[in-house]
């Protein structure tokens, strides 16, 4: 079944390369599984940038070696991700799935373009 | 503190119907699927089914299809049973249950007896 | 319908002594989404079910360690390493992986 999932447009990796936004998706209702997966569209390609899956008893788990952490309160994830460069700058779409109890319920985001700028390095100084 | 607290069973003749009662305190109501499950006197526990208390999207097990109705009354926090055309058959506990991927609540439960 | 078997249907043990109680379903109770909702529960005379054990291996918060789940597919186990006197009661599996979700039998652990 479909479900919607919301996103913001654009935003602006800080100097470091974290980037943070909030991923909202349509009301849970009784879900109690939930797996969000953010992935990272490059011209037709998308790749699974990490994933985790929570329960309504506990918080949101990203992988220790994972790029992304993240909270989730409700139906709200608020992703960040990590050690993003300026190759990094892309669309990145959060991809919410309810895993239980049924039915299945899945729902995309339209995707949020990441600027990355990469810092100048400091110039010598005489 | 999250509790479930069950009203409504009684001494009932057979063909009645009656409306038990499970009134959930201490969480969101509407984050949590209520599931019933029958223990007849002296023998096991036996899942009903449960209702969506987000969409009252209920869920019934084949042996309580038919005469068994779920319900809720999201303004009072509260899920009902309702059983017509009662039988002998119905005689029984019923516990109303919070689900997630578990159940950590239980009601107390409530007896019903059917006999003329 | 899936249907939970559990054996034995009663079982006498001694203080300090273990405990082990099968479940076998009659289809494999892993969900969709590779997970498996094996539950145990403890049911003493005149009170709700507790929950023990989810998710075949978890131990629900402020149950004792001398309590351990595991199996996979189709089996499973629930094995008390030393039986104590509040153990007695009444034990059943539940599976909520395929609707209609199911409880075992019930399985009697009484003491010696």
């Known amino acids: 079944k479909g479900m919607h999932a919301a996103q913001p447009a654009v935003v602006l990796a800080s100097s470091r390369g974290v980037a943070s936004f909030v991923c909202e998706y349509g009301s849970s209702g009784n879900a109690a599984e939930v797996r969000v997966t953010m992935l990272r569209q490059a011209g037709s390609q998308m790749t699974e940038v990490c994933a985790a899956t929570y329960t309504v008893e506990d918080e949101l788990a990203f992988l220790d070696d994972s790029t992304c952490t993240g909270t989730s309160s409700g139906n709200k994830v608020n992703l960040t991700i990590q050690g993003l460069r300026a190759m990094g700058t892309g669309l990145y779409i959060c991809k919410v799935e309810l895993m239980y109890p049924p039915p299945y319920y899945v729902g995309m985001g339209n995707g949020t373009q990441i600027y990355v700028i990469d810092p100048e390095p400091c110039p010598d100084s005489d | 503190e999250i509790q479930l607290v069950q009203s409504g069973g009684d001494l009932v003749k057979p063909g009645g119907s009656v409306r038990l009662s499970c009134k959930a305190s201490?969480?969101?109501?509407?984050?949590?699927?209520m599931n019933w499950v029958k223990q007849a006197p002296g023998k096991g526990l036996q899942w009903m089914g449960w209702?969506?208390?987000?969409?009252?999207?209920?869920t019934y097990a084949d042996d309580f299809k038919g005469r068994f109705t779920f319900s809720l009354d999201n303004a009072k926090n509260t899920a009902y049973l309702q059983i017509n055309s009662l039988r002998a058959e119905d005689t029984a506990v019923y516990f109303c249950?919070?689900?997630?991927?578990?159940?950590?609540?239980w009601g107390q439960g409530t007896t019903l007896t059917v006999s003329s | 319908d899936v249907l939970m078997t559990q054996t034995p249907l009663s079982l006498s043990v001694s203080p300090g002594e273990p405990a082990s109680i099968s479940c076998r379903s009659s289809?494999?109770?892993?969900?969709?989404?590779?997970?498996?909702?094996l539950e145990w529960y403890l049911q003493k005379p005149g009170q709700s079910p507790k929950l023990l054990i989810y998710?075949?291996?978890n131990r629900f918060s402020g149950v004792p360690d001398r309590f351990s789940g595991s199996g996979s597919g189709t089996d499973f186990t629930l094995r008390i390493s030393r039986v104590e006197a509040d153990d007695a009661g009444v034990y059943y599996c539940?599976?909520?992986?395929?609707?209609?979700?199911?409880f075992g039998g019930g399985t009697k652990l009484e003491l010696k």
């Open positions: 249950a919070r689900r997630s991927i578990y159940y950590p609540y």
């Open positions: 201490g969480y969101t109501f509407t984050n949590y699927g």
């Open positions: 209702i969506n208390t987000y969409t009252g999207e209920p």
């Open positions: 289809q494999s109770i892993v969900y969709s989404n590779g997970n498996t909702y």
């Open positions: 998710k075949v291996s």
């Open positions: 539940f599976q909520g992986s395929h609707v209609p979700w199911t």
